[in-house]
């Protein structure tokens, strides 16, 4: 058993049928010695008397808010949550496996640049009685500071019969140098509580590996005289690290017909312009990627050929 | 400590081409190592990230773009003195700071070159003959060093009398390649910045 926060405790259970559970001793936070009784949740049934209460915690029915009273007055509370260990592996019931970029990916994180700011998000099908708390650091043995905000519900989607909820959080490394070569990964820890179930999820990454630039901006077409060709031009996204000559991007320019089956023409360039043939009803898209370290491509920025 | 904005003559920056070749070569070598050594801990998540140049060179600091010198987090207190007769820019405008940066890069390359050659000698003794260093990568390191054209004492190749532990050698190869790839990215960024300045 360990304390999650004031008056909230997590009981770790080896979870299998007929498991013996864990013996837990609760102590009433009071100078009083006599006449103390204990109850669980809203029940008025007295579970025991005395300054301490010993309970055997086996299942969720044994978890909840234990309250000690004296003469009708509440003295203190202890909320017991359960953390299930199933065959040596902590349960992951609360969050959905996003399966990207690999199986058992519960937290996904992205950064728009090298400033040390990043966003993480996760999915769940649970809509109520759910709380998250996020902590982060650079490295784990001698952790350096990363400050995270509160997790917020950022999207709701319908998937088949189920509703899916996306939560996200923004974090910022306290003293980040965009040019630094990372040797210690960022660690992100999410505590999830659903009703009386506690779970924790972690992700470890280097900012360089989660970079995904914003799409190029100001995408424009300039027709070339007496030609089906057009000059496409664009700019670095505002959110990208500067100076751009140091934090350079490379670009992919794509000409896509109306039909998805039509052949796509693709050009790769380090410049912020390219000359392509603009077909009728086609559209031109451009996306960006760090020129020197192949992390994710940005989403496409698009303009119609007409 | 930082790079001033210099204006080299156009087409006078041979190092940019060499640094791009270097990044390509080390990335290919790392990919090959990860595939060949699939049963070894060779991914970024599994290895310890060690920098053999730590406390010996200070490339990131010495080559910091002018725009980032206002960022206190970028200004570490590591100071290292370097030889300052680089000729990569082939321009008299090469400042002391730029020379410090380029000489730091040169020292990095020299250290990695020695490590890779020592390691290759060990890998050649492996009866499994599982993996060797790409000669192209070693050649590209050499080419960039020549383009940087710094005079520096030659570091003798380390020789080891004890029987090599091939498992450990292959894991060290992965560690070195990961670190060298990161340094090659920094070198490429620096060369691109200098080229644009």
């Amino acid at each position: 058993i360990w304390e999650l926060k004031k008056d909230v405790y997590v009981v770790e259970l080896d979870w299998y049928p007929d498991a013996p559970g864990e013996m837990v001793v609760l102590t009433c936070d009071t100078p009083e010695e006599d006449g103390i009784t204990w109850t669980l949740d809203q029940s008025s049934e007295v579970l025991g008397s005395g300054k301490t209460l010993t309970i055997q915690v086996k299942e969720f029915g044994d978890a909840g808010q234990y309250t000690c009273h004296k003469g009708g007055e509440v003295l203190s509370h202890s909320l017991l949550l359960l953390h299930k260990k199933e065959d040596g592996i902590w349960s992951t019931d609360i969050l959905k496996d996003q399966k990207e970029p690999k199986n058992k990916t519960f937290l996904r994180c992205e950064a728009k640049n090298y400033s040390g700011r990043f966003t993480c998000w996760w999915l769940t099908t649970i809509s109520t009685d759910l709380t998250f708390s996020v902590k982060s650091s650079r490295g784990s043995s001698d952790p350096q500071g990363v400050t995270c905000g509160a997790a917020t519900l950022s999207a709701e989607r319908v998937r088949g019969d189920n509703k899916e909820y996306e939560y996200s959080v923004e974090c910022q490394e306290d003293s980040a140098c965009p040019a630094a070569e990372e040797s210690l990964p960022i660690e992100v820890m999410v505590d999830a509580v659903h009703k009386l179930k506690y779970e924790n999820y972690t992700s470890s990454f280097f900012i360089r590996d989660i970079i995904k630039p914003d799409p190029p901006k100001n995408l424009q077409l300039k027709p070339l005289k007496n030609s089906r060709q057009v000059e496409v031009s664009w700019e670095y996204p505002d959110t990208w690290s500067t100076p751009h000559s140091y934090f350079s991007l490379t670009f992919c320019v794509q000409v896509q017909g109306k039909s998805k089956r039509e052949k796509k023409d693709r050009v790769f360039t380090d410049k912020t312009s390219a000359t392509v043939i603009c077909r009728k009803n086609a559209s031109i898209s451009v996306r960006a990627q760090d020129r020197y370290y192949s992390s994710s491509w940005s989403e496409w920025a698009s303009v119609p050929c007409s | 400590r930082n790079l001033p904005v210099a204006t080299p003559d156009p087409g006078m920056f041979p190092c940019l081409h060499h640094s791009q070749n270097l990044l390509r070569a080390v990335s290919n070598m790392l990919q090959k190592a990860r595939q060949t050594l699939e049963f070894y801990p060779c991914t970024s998540e599994e290895i310890d990230h060690e920098d053999i140049t730590k406390d010996k060179t200070s490339t990131v600091e010495a080559c910091l773009p002018l725009e980032l010198t206002k960022n206190e987090s970028c200004l570490n207190s590591r100071e290292t003195s370097f030889i300052t007769n680089g000729s990569c820019l082939a321009s008299r405008k090469t400042s002391f700071m730029m020379a410090l940066c380029l000489s730091s890069i040169y020292e990095d390359l020299k250290m990695y070159q020695v490590e890779f050659k020592t390691m290759n000698a060990k890998l050649l003794m492996d009866p499994k003959r599982q993996i060797f260093l790409d000669q192209n990568m070693l050649a590209v390191i050499d080419e960039l060093m020549q383009a940087l054209n710094f005079n520096s004492e030659t570091v003798p190749q380390k020789s080891s009398l004890e029987e090599p532990d091939f498992y450990k050698t292959k894991i060290k190869l992965c560690i070195l390649l990961h670190a060298f790839r990161i340094r090659a990215v920094t070198i490429d960024r620096v060369m691109s910045y200098l080229n644009a300045s």
Partner: antibody, heavy 115, light 112 residues
Amino acid sequence: QVQLVQSGGGVVQPGRSLRLSCAASGFTFSSYGMHWVRQAPGKGLEWVAFIRYDGSNKYYADSVKGRFTISRDNSKNTLYLQMKSLRAEDTAVYYCKTHGSHDNWGQGTMVTVSS
Amino acid sequence: SYVLTQPPSVSGTPGQRVTISCSGGRSNIGSNHVKWYQQLPGTAPKLLIYGNDQRPSGVPDRFSGSKSGTSASLAITGVQAEDEADYYCQSYDRGTHPALLFGTGTKVTVLG
């Protein structure tokens, strides 16, 4: 005490269907994940499928994906394996089993796929 | 499809020490617990070892388990005639959990 009693096995022709059941007692069935494991005659153990305690997630071995469906009825304390498009290579003793460090197995039920 | 490799058979005379190896990789045994099962002919498997080296109550202490790196082993010290059975190791793969990974199985024969 924990008990898992299996039923539904038998002889079936290739391409036909069969549903296995596993009735649980002696524990809170709705709190625990459950597996199906099979063993072909003279062969080793092969995992078939898993279902979460609440039925929200199901996992299958590649060899049965798209043909077999694991399900549970927590109100009846019963686990099911619906097997469709059966093949000769599905011939095996099928076991249900609880998930956890200490597990409990059903007695097994024989499924023979033969023409 | 078996990722955990066991020797097909091992044998020993009563009283001898018999060991069975189970070889896997970094993503399975290297990062998860190992279990060992005993299966007597015509019966369901019986749990002998969980959590690499833990014995459930009721399992004789002549059975012991250990794990090192990407391999695990089961030892029977002072093997007895009733130990003649098939033995399976089991673990998970970190990418496919909760799918069970079973070893190829080992037939233990008690001679004499």
